[in-house]
């Protein structure tokens, strides 16, 4: 998990369907008792913002030590600061926990930029605004780090919610969510509603504001509107999915769909941006520029470096196009699309904004490791990580930022043929050569 772009850390919907319209799906009925409905105690349990990550409060050890932990679906280690660091207000003190057990093993996690290293152990962990359970989980006690913790982010650790295959040092280290499901009756599913503010938040506002919800073990109907549409998890390592088509304002990018998933496509709450493979990024930016051609913006803006500022309240959202990603559906030859607005992919930046200005960074960037559907995408939707049924669900988030003319959307079904061909098969490589971080 990497900072900045990769953290550890958010109708006018044109476009013809890919072919014939199929009859509209209805919401499936609950598969297991307790998986759907109301999870009042977990609603609003996240704070933060897309640029620095969303975090949940957790307790570790006996007596419990409270820490804020970044929710990261793009990694699989539960790792917490365990030594003083200039950016940490508090840290896990193993010596104060009577239930801590040392595994006598180290862990080293390098990123494209930065790294963390620490010592492995286990301890009792619970989530105060989560299920009423305590589990013994693996914990990486971070003793040294570089460019990992973010100044002012208010989180002290990271909760990797992906699968064991990408855990460090190896897949034998059971991730937290696996431990939770094994040791309790919590269903093997969680859902995330990340709520981008749509305007800059200063430090005190972030602390006071709601950042969203992580519903552990279920789906809360109050957090979304319309229907949930599911896409298969292609492989259980990252939350890998398959994108079959991309449109900008309803115009197909017309690329070989393999390009969209080269070398993978993942859903990652710990990444700020929507990150696209080089060729796809270039085509998308060209199309976004064309759609907004009445205005011309500096080169550095499209690189995600320069900020563009408008007088407060005058941001011309209408000149920027909507972006639609079509995802493989659960039914053969069926896809659905998720559509985001500029309110999602133009990220408000607080550092420079005055009462006179609203300043934004372009939050779509280039990737050399595939598509990453980061906070920019997730802030538009309620996202269900249905591990039990190996699928990810998307519905329009009840908290997404929009205007009076356009809204984010989840629509389907669409007919799409040969979707399996859109997946890229990564050549088997010695795992030691794989880069963890995504720049």
């Amino acid at each position: 998990t990497q900072h900045g772009i990769r953290l550890p850390l958010r109708s006018g919907l044109g476009g013809a369907p890919l072919g014939l319209r199929l009859p509209r799906e209805t919401d499936e009925e609950p598969e297991e008792p307790g998986r759907r409905g109301s999870f009042v105690e977990m609603v609003d349990n996240l704070r933060g913002k897309s640029g620095q990550g969303y975090y949940v409060e957790m307790t570790v050890g006996s007596p419990p030590q409270t820490l804020n932990i970044l929710v990261d679906t793009g990694s699989s280690n539960f790792a917490v600061g365990a030594a003083p660091h200039p950016f940490l207000h508090r840290y896990y003190q193993r010596q104060l926990s009577s239930t801590y057990r040392d595994l006598r093993k180290g862990v080293y996690v390098p990123y494209t930029q930065g790294k963390w290293e620490g010592e492995l152990g286990t301890d009792l962990v619970s989530i105060p605004h989560g299920p009423n359970v305590t589990v013994r989980a693996n914990i990486a006690a971070i003793t040294e780090s570089d460019k990992f913790f973010i100044n002012g982010s208010n989180w002290e650790g990271i909760l990797g919610l992906a699968y064991a295959e990408i855990a460090r040092p190896d897949d034998s280290l059971e991730p937290f969510f696996d431990s939770l499901v094994k040791q309790t009756h919590v269903p093997n599913l969680f859902s995330l509603q990340l709520c981008g503010a749509g305007f800059p938040l200063n430090q005190s506002e972030v602390l006071a504001s709601v950042g969203g919800s992580m519903i552990i073990g279920g789906i809360d109907h109050s957090l979304y509107t319309g229907s949930l549409w599911y896409t298969p998890i292609r492989r259980e390592w990252y939350y890998e999915v398959i994108i079959v088509r991309v449109e900008i304002n309803g115009q197909d990018l017309k690329m070989d769909c393999k390009e969209y998933n080269y070398d993978k496509s993942i859903v990652d709450s710990g990444t700020t941006n929507l990150r696209l493979p080089k060729k796809v990024f270039e085509a998308a930016v060209k199309s976004i520029k064309a759609a907004s051609s009445t205005e011309k913006f500096p080169d550095g803006f499209w690189l995600g470096e320069q900020l563009v500022c408008w007088q407060a309240g005058t941001t011309p959202w209408n000149i920027f196009p909507v972006i639609s990603l079509y995802l493989m559906g659960e039914v053969t030859n069926q896809s659905f699309r998720i559509t985001i607005l500029p309110q999602q992919y133009l990220r408000p930046v607080e550092d420079v904004a005055t009462s006179q200005d609203d300043c934004y960074k372009f939050a779509i960037s280039q990737s050399s490791t595939g598509t990453v559907m980061g906070a920019v995408i997730m802030e538009g939707f309620y996202v269900v990580f249905d591990r039990a049924r190996k699928r990810i669900g998307f519905a329009v988030s009840a908290c997404h930022v929009h205007d009076e003319f356009r809204t984010a959307a989840v629509e389907g079904p669409f007919v799409t043929l040969d979707m399996e061909d859109c997946g890229y098969n990564i050549p088997q490589t010695d795992e030691s050569t794989l880069m963890t971080g995504r720049a």
Epitope: S293, K296, F297, D299, G300, E305, V352
Partner: antibody, heavy 120, light 108 residues
Framework: QLQLQESGPGLVKPSETLSLTCTVS??????????WGWIRQPPGKGLEWIGM???????WYNPSLKSRVTISVDTSKNQFSLKLSSVTAADTAVYYC????????????WGRGTLVTVSS | EIVLTQSPATLSLSPGERATLSCRAS??????LAWYQQKPGQAPRLLIY???KRATGIPARFSGSGSGTDFTLTISSLEPEDFAVYYC??????????FGGGTKVEIK
């Protein structure tokens, strides 16, 4: 090579409208890689950005002057213009037109400037 | 709003000496900073952009460095024609409207 030249009255009465034109020669104002801007400099003081325009007509203004400023473009004449209404003595300055290049960020080519005095 | 502070206000040096001018931003501007030279009665001229890139036709004695909040313009050996006022400008926030107050390099 490309040159910019400001023109317009050197004296404007208070409360009236200051009007200046910048003529671009040696290249087309419609080339898509540039904005065209106005900057002013009161006597003995620093530089103040007024605003800029794209050949399509898209404009950006300094918020402190926005209510009084209009910048327009005439691609057929290869010119862009500045109008500043309700002027006072504080608007006395050398007015420069400039091209915004290098990734549409920096003023890489300037006119020689024209002094406009606001006085009755 | 990002404020650019230039120092010193005036720098008195002799030809052949090295001039070091500073521009400090109130917040990080990455490398999106330019330096302009203005001689009396003339328009400003772009010297350096993106903190360290020399504009077309600018002699090698002019160099820019820095990123984030602290930037430096260095003139390795002052020529008589280098005595002028120098302005920095940030374009990290766009449109490009923020200039520093200027540093005057005068003959000692």
């Amino acid at each position: 090579q490309l040159q910019l030249q400001e023109s317009g009255p050197g004296l404007v009465k208070p409360s009236e409208t200051l009007s200046l034109t910048c003529t671009v020669s040696g290249g087309s104002i419609s080339r898509g890689s540039y904005y065209w801007g106005w900057i002013r400099q009161p006597p003995g003081k620093g530089l103040e950005w007024i605003g800029m325009i794209y050949y399509s007509g898209s404009t950006w203004y300094n918020p402190s002057l926005k209510s009084r400023v209009t910048i327009s473009v005439d691609t057929s004449k290869n010119q862009f213009s500045l109008k500043l209404s309700s002027v006072t003595a504080a608007d006395t300055a050398v007015y420069y037109c400039a091209r915004v290049g290098h990734g549409i960020s920096y003023f890489d080519l300037w006119g020689r400037g024209t002094l406009v005095t606001v006085s009755s | 709003e990002i404020v650019l502070t230039q120092s010193p206000a005036t720098l008195s040096l002799s030809p052949g000496e090295r001039a070091t001018l500073s521009c400090r931003a109130s917040q990080s501007v990455s490398s999106y900073l330019a330096w302009y030279q203005q001689k009396p009665g003339q328009a400003p001229r772009l010297l350096i952009y993106d903190a360290s890139k020399r504009a077309t036709g600018i002699p090698a004695r002019f160099s820019g460095s820095g990123s984030g909040t602290d930037f430096t313009l260095t003139i390795s050996s002052l020529e008589p024609e280098d005595f002028a006022v120098y302005y920095c400008q940030q374009v990290y926030t766009w449109p490009p409207r923020t200039f520093g107050g200027g540093t005057k390099v005068e003959i000692k």
